[in-house]
Amino acid sequence: MRRGPRSLRGRDAPAPTPCVPAECFDLLVRHCVACGLLRTPRPKPAGASSPAPRTALQPQESVGAGAGEAALPLPGLL
């Protein structure tokens, strides 16, 4: 039989989100979602004014061992 559950967080990770590692935590809607539903920002030319997609904060974690990522709203919206 395989071993028990993996640790919920990596040794260097911040406090874990409530998500399992397969999901990411979206701070805009305050719940876990499939990570593919989060969009990471792409480099934009200087002076571009269109709003960027939401981004995510990546905890420092071992691959497969940490909590889900936390998606953050844009700095301008904080």
């Epitope: 395989r2 028990g4 559950p5 993996r6 919920l8 409530p18 998500c19 399992v20 590692p21 397969a22 999901e23 990411c24 719940h31 876990c32 499939a34 990570c35 593919g36 539903l37 989060l38 990471t40 981004t55 995510a56 990546q58 691959v63 497969g64 990522e69």
Partner: antibody, heavy 118, light 113 residues
Framework: EVKLVESGGGLVQPGGSLSLSCAAS????????MSWVRQPPGKALEWLGF??????????EYSASVKGRFTISRDKSQSIFYLQMNALRPEDSATYYC?????????WGQGTSVTVSS | DIVMSQSPSSLAVSVGEKVTMSCKSS????????????LAWYQQKPGQSPKLLIY???TRESGVPDRFTGSGSGTDFTLTISSVKAEDLAVYYC?????????FGGGTKLEIK
Amino acid sequence: EVKLVESGGGLVQPGGSLSLSCAASGFTFTDYYMSWVRQPPGKALEWLGFIRNKANGYTTEYSASVKGRFTISRDKSQSIFYLQMNALRPEDSATYYCASLRSALDYWGQGTSVTVSS
Amino acid sequence: DIVMSQSPSSLAVSVGEKVTMSCKSSQSLLYSNNQKNYLAWYQQKPGQSPKLLIYWASTRESGVPDRFTGSGSGTDFTLTISSVKAEDLAVYYCQQYYIYPYTFGGGTKLEIK
């Protein structure tokens, strides 16, 4: 020892209902999401949906093929969860597996067979 | 929905041979923030339930023999068995868990000559 045991399968008529159960033991049930996956005879696996853990308010996600007809829930003791299947169709005939979800579908039950036929 | 395509659908190899099977997704499964690919491989032996072999495309589940190796990124993934044993007779499925609904490939059936 991690154990997932499904029950409740059987023969049901088209349009009928059935409730499947999955009893979990041997791990911290509240850390996991719990999924249902089915497999028609001789065919591939199909993910049906999952229910998140207590920290996430037991929210659910479903595949389009069963949304509105199937409901996933957990009991208050958090060690059993359910798949309530309504408006069953012949194409719902399959072996139904429960599986725990963390980094992927980590642990699987042995499955329970559902046949929808008149 | 993300479509997962596996090839070949079946293959027969002799004990001790190396085998590779492919899984392709209709869109990238790589989340750029953490460089993880949301892809898993499962083994289903005849008459049994599936068993997790690989997650994050390349991380071997505890207890899985090291002859099983997952590789690839983005849309193209491979499961390699370095030296097949008779007990590896099974159907192997890939699955994405990047976007709902999670979807499985059609499977690759490994037969032993």
